[in-house]
């Protein structure tokens, strides 16, 4: 007996499709070996039609696929547009040749069944309504009109013109005539269910002169759309239910055996498993809406259904749309920490992945807010100015080409705790969710700036020092000037290879920044931070105020206006002329101009218009230079 298992008999009709699942034993070899579907000929030979190696026969071109699900130990063969020629004996199997482990499957494709010649076929989806047209001769105009549903023995009344209604059609069936036309009556049945499918007879009059019409009502469950998504990526369920339910509450639920558990609805219900990673967005007045889920997990795979009903819950007889979501564990999206922890007063550096093939895409960072339907207003982006309430403490550093950009948030408070999304205007699958947890600080911060109340005097020299612990000794230290377009790293001299130090004096590790001479443009936020290559670490921020010199204060005349940045290294003074690029403001149409999907992420897109470059290390609008002192004892 074969260890492969599947359906022994599959029967369908022309034009339909089949989805054949074959089960294999749970071994590593089985999971990775070739899967195939072949047709058995009279000679006993089995001709491959499709295999997991990418082979697809001519007769299956454009209408079949084979998908392996190693996590379930199954593979599925989907075949569409069936014809009677597809009837036959097949094998689904594993192995490099078609003589490997296999299971016999018999497929029978029949003609669409013949109906009485005068039968009118109505095909409707579950939850929709149908209006059946019933013509009659003028002489039957005064007679009773009726619609009945055929059962094995009789024809059970649905509704008639004397206002008799079958209990299972109360509130759903209406018999009416239009205008002055006395040759046709109509029956409308709403909120269709599977049970309404079948043969009906319209009748006007009685006995041999009665007018009769056969009706075949087909009620279809929507075929689930198959969605294949990578672990940690995002998925959007686009739900289009039609104008008739435009004003009803909308929901997305996941099938759980007998029930469909609501994940989110427009009445504010949300499954805690999806906290921080789901949004529901009404699209228009035609009953269209979408649900976006980010940070996909293995357990998110399953059968989803969207619908509309005043209760915000699934109800039989209301329109639905369905999907089967598969989550591929062999993901292209790197495995990053989904929870980042910070302390009050401290900072976090969040590495956001993006598709490396889209290095020029615009990068954004938004904060997920669960109120209402959920939204994610953008806080910062490569062409979006930092939101006002984040002034001096939020910046985005784009590192073109390496598939990562970094968002730094400092001066943390417990209010900052929550969910944040990394996203771009490119590949929407690369949306990732980060939960930021902020605990009360229990010790001094790693980076400390002195003096803490920094007021610089116009025209004079001003120095601030950033103290760092020994554990940051080998890391690169930097100062940057913050603006709402990013934090521009100030130039410093690379000290070259440092001599290794056996002991490290905790009290004397510092990096200083000198403004010489202080100008009005120097006023603002400055950050001191550490990084290792392109990996950013902790930061601390200080606001430097600039005020006019009061009478009697000394004035330092710089000897050389072109050499204003100095680096003091172990008592050795090195002069260096540094000309800094001027930042040219680049007018742009705003971060969402050509990006419909991003607009759906946050309903505050219009607040994030900006010009200029954000977070780049080479754009700066001030012309004064800076000096870093590294003191080593």
């Amino acid at each position: 007996k074969s260890p492969i298992f599947g359906p022994q008999e599959v029967s369908s009709i022309e034009g339909d499709s089949v989805s054949i699942t074959c089960y294999y034993p749970d071994t590593s070899v089985n999971r990775h070996t070739r899967k195939y579907w072949c047709r058995q000929g009279a000679s006993g030979m089995c001709t491959t039609l499709i295999s997991s190696n990418g082979y697809l026969s001519k007769e299956y071109s454009g209408r079949a696929n084979l998908i392996n699900f190693p996590e379930n130990n199954t593979f599925v063969i989907n075949i569409e547009q069936l014809t009677q020629d597809d009837t036959g004996s097949y094998k689904c199997g594993l192995g490099t040749s078609n003589r490997g482990l296999s299971f016999d499957v018999s497929l029978e494709v029949s003609q669409v069944p013949e109906l009485p010649s005068d039968t009118h076929v109505y095909t409707k989806d579950i939850g929709r309504n149908v209006t059946i047209e019933c013509p009659f001769k003028r002489e039957n105009a005064p007679s009773k009109k009726s619609l009945c549903k055929k059962t094995n023995q009789s024809c059970e009344l649905v509704i008639d013109s004397t206002e008799k209604v079958n209990p299972s059609y109360i509130g759903r069936a209406k018999l009416f005539m239009k205008g002055t036309d006395l040759t046709v009556f109509y029956v409308n049945i709403s909120h269709l269910t599977h049970n309404d499918a079948g043969l009906y007879i319209c009748q006007a009059g009685e006995g041999p002169s009665a007018d009769k019409k056969n009706v075949d009502l087909q009620v279809l469950a929507p075929e689930p759309e198959l969605l294949y998504k990578d672990l940690r990526s995002s998925v959007t369920f686009e739900c289009d239910l039609g104008r008739e339910v435009a004003n009803e509450a909308k929901y997305l639920c996941r099938m759980n055996k007998e029930t469909c558990d609501v994940i989110i609805n427009t009445l504010g219900k949300r499954d805690p498993d999806f906290e921080g990673r789901i949004l529901i967005t009404p699209k228009d007045d035609n009953g269209r809406f979408s649900v976006l889920i980010t940070g996909l997990r293995k357990e998110d795979a399953g059968h989803y259904q969207c619908g509309a009903h005043s209760s915000g819950l699934p109800q039989e007889g209301w329109p639905i749309q369905t999907w089967q979501l598969f989550v591929n564990e062999e993901s292209t999206i790197p495995n990053r920490r989904s929870v980042v922890k910070g302390v009050t007063g401290g900072s976090v550096a969040i590495a956001c992945p993006y598709n490396p093939k889209e290095s020029s895409s615009l990068k954004y960072w938004c904060r997920w807010e669960g109120d209402g339907n959920g939204h994610c207003p953008v806080l910062v982006g490569t062409q979006a100015q930092v939101q006002e309430e984040y002034e001096g403490r939020l910046a985005l550093f784009d590192q073109p080409g390496n598939g990562t950009y970094t968002v730094i948030l400092n001066q943390l408070t417990t209010e900052d705790a929550g969910f944040y999304w990394c996203l771009t205007n490119g590949d929407s699958r690369w949306r990732t969710t980060i939960e930021l947890q902020v605990a009360e600080a229990t010790r001094e911060p790693n980076l400390e700036v002195t003096p803490q109340n920094a007021t610089a005097v116009l025209g004079e020299t001003f120095t601030v020092s950033c103290h760092y612990p020994c554990k940051f000794y080998s890391q690169e230290k930097y100062w940057c000037k913050w603006s709402n377009k990013g934090c521009h790293i100030l130039p410093s001299h690379d000290e070259g290879a440092r001599q290794s130090s056996v002991s490290c004096d905790q009290s004397s590790q510092l990096v200083s920044m000198t403004l010489n001479p202080v100008s009005k443009e120097d006023e603002g936020w400055y950050w001191c931070g550490v990084k290792q290559g392109q990996t950013y670490g902790e930061t601390t921020a200080i606001y430097i105020a600039v005020e006019e010199r009061t009478r009697g204060s000394s004035h330092v005349n710089p000897t050389d206006a072109n050499a204003r940045a100095k680096v003091a290294l172990e008592e050795e003074v090195v002069d260096s002329s540094i000309s800094e690029k001027e930042n040219k403001a680049i007018p742009n149409p705003g971060p969402f101009a050509n990006e419909r999907e991003i607009q759906n992420v946050g309903d505050q897109a219009q607040e994030n218009r900006a010009s200029g470059d954000a977070g780049s290390a080479d754009g700066q609008s001030r012309s004064s230079s800076s000096k870093h002192h590294h003191h080593h004892h």
Epitope: H194, M255, E316
Partner: nanobody
Amino acid sequence: QVQLVESGGGLVQAGDSLRLSCAASGRTFTTYVMGWFRQPPGKEREFVATISWSGSTTYKYYADSVKGRFTISRDNAKNTVYLQMNSLKPEDTAVYYCAASTVVADPRAPNEYDYWGQGTQVTVSS
């Protein structure tokens, strides 16, 4: 909720035939995967056959031990599933259970099914 009622069991001779019926009441019948399982005396419950459908496509699964002898079928109008058992053997003696579920990952696994009937006894004497 779905109620399942089996009928058609009995005592037969080896080589004879029997037809079991499973009548379902409750929710929409056509949305279910319906299966037959059996429990021989002193043994675990085991898979016999399952029928599932999607639109106009029907899928039938059988255990190796009954292939070619048993046939599973359905009548949607009557909300009933049948198990036609031919060429019965003494080892087919068991209590036969009807089972139903809306979603089944593996049709052979009893724990995949949400609803069960009370069972009907089939005894095959030699």
